[in-house]
Amino acid sequence: AVDLTLLANLRLTDPQRFFLTCVSGEAGAGRGSDAWGPPLLLEKDDRIVRTPPGPPLRLARNGSHQVTLRGFSKPSDLVGVFSCVGGAGARRTRVIYVHNSPGAHLLPDKVTHTVNKGDTAVLSARVHKEKQTDVIWKSNGSYFYTLDWHEAQDGRFLLQLPNVQPPSSGIYSATYLEASPLGSAFFRLIVRGCGAGRWGPGCTKECPGCLHGGVCHDHDGECVCPPGFTGTRCEQACREGRFGQSCQEQCPGISGCRGLTFCLPDPYGCSCGSGWRGSQCQEACAPGHFGADCRLQCQCQNGGTCDRFSGCVCPSGWHGVHCEKSDRIPQILNMASELEFNLETMPRINCAAAGNPFPVRGSIELRKPDGTVLLSTKAIVEPEKTTAEFEVPRLVLADSGFWECRVSTSGGQDSRRFKVNVKVPPVPLAAPRLLTKQSRQLVVSPLVSFSGDGPISTVRLHYRPQDSTMDWSTIVVDPSENVTLMNLRPKTGYSVRVQLSRPGEGGEGAWGPPTLMTTDCPEPLLQPWLEGWHVEGTDRLRVSWSLPLVPGPLVGDGFLLRLWDGTRGQERRENVSSPQARTALLTGLTPGTHYQLDVQLYHCTLLGPASPPAHVLLPPSGPPAPRHLHAQALSDSEIQLTWKHPEALPGPISKYVVEVQVAGGAGDPLWIDVDRPEETSTIIRGLNASTRYLFRMRASIQGLGDWSNTVEESTLGNGLQAEGPVQESRAAEEGLDQ
């Protein structure tokens, strides 16, 4: 059961001094928004018992495992139902306290009633201030039954509930007709899900036999021990003034637990602390009585004396609940009431015993829940005891439950039951989450949901490059912190897996599912400079750039050249895929366009800072080609060219350019300008005799236009070697006349 206690301070002379405190002994209780546990909640539950609104109650947290409710201004504030909720996940548990007004017309003889399934429950409301009206019984706020005012027996109104079932559980109240609800007697009925002494699904399992008023939990078979008692079967008394599953809490104030009501998880309910009784838990137990509400009788034998907190205190030579066992009878010593092991481990369990005659190895045995008996493999004999060691076969889940150590000698026998919890090592259900990445590190959140049992003691993160067969690197981390995987390779995928462990041997769970995390590509930091550019034609631009000289390798995959045509609102991007490149030829540009040009280094998909932008004006494109070019030899050194003007001219032609080249020759061509653009004929002079020439021409407006078709022609005869071609132009008709 969850270690959760709701304390009510019942010194009611002054409501302002009244307080409720909820204390959790759970590991990590109340830590709030972290991954390990929701906070403790303590509140008044107005769903069934409604009281007039007052100033809001004050909630104060004392550390992580205690919360206190104060600020009650008048007695009516106290009446009703209060609840505390604690524990995490499936263990989340609600503890309920029902408060009755001391001045009510009717008072409960007993507030909490815990009964077994099928039992008859009897609720008894004692008349405190008589009214000659009917008594209405309600269940969970709804009408249930009416008793006539003269049906009281010995000043009590009784409600009998035969054959109760778990749905009958809840808050019951008895109220005089037309009286204030605050004058009601409020009860809490808890119906266990099983018959007496049974627990589990189908109620097939036997309870361990809870001592000292402990109540067997119908779901897990554990004893919910009264305040002031501990152990698997509540067999041990705490020191006076202490409570909690391990006696770890202490009652506040100098008078110990006097005046405090203790409420524990169902099916226990509420009671006074050990050694106290009465409606306000202010009366000490009568002689011969002890325990919570003084419900237990000592009946000490052999000279034992009764302590109202712990029961019989035995004289030397005797032990047992009633001092009925002689020390000659063997006795199991210091057996832990609960042990925890991890699944599939093979633990060693020790069991120590003393007695007269002295126990030997063969006289101590260990019995598993399925009845299997284990014999000890080794015994350590000391002057005052024998300790038997048992090697337990590999544990399975079915081994969870009550085990028993038994010692038998000729002096008698003793046995001690203890609970073994077989825990399943945690296995992550999801892969770890990537928080941030850099070129050489990944920041990972390792905390994921898991199957199996907590608490998580360690988190191991295993990682290695994707598709690698190398050993996994492992880092052990704090469960609540993010992890930074360092010294990784840039631009590399890593397979990352989580492994969780819980405390104890064999607590390491299987590895969780892998996830792929890729390191970043570092940002390119270098800003290039555009060092030069020149036009290689109306649509071609050669660009060169430089980078700052920095130590170390260049971080970059290449360069991006951007040309922005502001007039048309168009951007042209040219990718240069070598980081060593420092020049590029841009072709297919729009002639006559003003471009803004810059260059930047790129790495993966990241762009570095751009160079300062440069402004480049491409020359406009020239006119179309001249039409119908024709060549005619005039002599051994002259050839006449004729043509027609280009069509659809964008403006007046400034000149023509003629290209002359010897057919089949390897030398450079010669360009001759025709500076009178209105002419359609020219004579090329100074040519070599009997030589074949190639001619083509183009017009120029602001820029040079397209070339015409190429024509071939040979000079005549065997004249002298000419100095080189020259030209003479005139109108075509005039040339023909000549």
Partner: antibody, heavy 117, light 107 residues
Framework: EVQLLESGGGLVQPGGSLRLSCAAS????????MAWVRQAPGKGLEWVSV????????FYADSVKGRFTISRDNSKNTLYLQMNSLRAEDTAVYYC??????????WGQGTTVTVSS | DIQMTQSPATLSLSPGERATLSCRAS??????LAWYQQKPGQAPRLLIY???NRATGIPARFSGSGSETDFTLTISSLEPEDFAVYYC?????????FGQGTKLEIK
């Protein structure tokens, strides 16, 4: 020791011209970009102009474009700023700075330019 | 142009205290941000480059953080010589632009 030393500042009338110089020493001048940054009296820093290591590329703030010209002589380890058509708002301390790829890592002590009639 | 806005304009602190100066860009500048310190009558000095890298010779009490549009310069424990004006500057886009400065003065 790495050093930059500005000179050429002074008082000039509106519309007039000045030429600032910045002499570099203690480092290989020709492999660094260089910049001019100014600071008007009581005001913050304002970036003015930059030139590439070879001098092949220059860039200017809009406020000085067409009036100022940045240049360098790598053989003399010197940076220049030719300032024409000066205005009252050009009054400032002018700093030259070495541009490494990540920022301006070396600064001169500055030279004062006052434009007033 | 990218606008750089620094806050606060003036920060009054005592030696030994922690100083946090903020710089915001009007659009993303990635991590291309530098911080400069300027004392009266002196030239600026580069402190931090590329948002978080200390320049040569800068004491470890100076640190920078942030990316995209929001950046912080932190001085973990102020020394008397740290009281000055601090400027941020982006190198992501042209023209390069500075913030208007934060004056760190002794309280």
């Amino acid at each position: 020791e790495v050093q930059l030393l500005e000179s050429g500042g002074g008082l000039v009338q509106p519309g007039g011209s000045l030429r600032l110089s910045c002499a570099a020493s203690g480092f290989t001048f020709s492999i660094y970009g260089m910049a001019w940054v100014r600071q008007a009296p009581g005001k913050g820093l304002e970036w003015v102009s930059v030139i590439s290591p070879s001098g092949g590329q220059t860039f200017y703030a809009d406020s000085v474009k067409g009036r100022f010209t940045i240049s360098r002589d790598n053989s003399k380890n010197t940076l220049y700023l030719q300032m024409n058509s000066l205005r009252a708002e050009d009054t400032a301390v002018y700093y030259c700075a070495r541009v490494y790829y990540y920022g301006m890592d070396v600064w001169g002590q500055g030279t004062t330019v006052t434009v007033s009639s | 142009d990218i606008q750089m806005t620094q806050s606060p304009a003036t920060l009054s602190l005592s030696p030994g205290e922690r100083a946090t100066l903020s710089c915001r860009a009007s659009q993303s500048v990635s991590s291309y941000l530098a911080w400069y310190q300027q004392k009266p009558g002196q030239a600026p000095r580069l402190l931090i480059y590329d948002a978080s890298n200390r320049a040569t010779g800068i004491p470890a009490r100076f640190s920078g953080s942030g990316s995209e549009t929001d950046f912080t310069l932190t001085i973990s424990s102020l020394e008397p010589e740290d009281f000055a004006v601090y400027y941020c500057q982006q190198r992501s886009k042209w023209p390069r632009t500075f913030g208007q400065g934060t004056k760190l003065e002794i309280k």
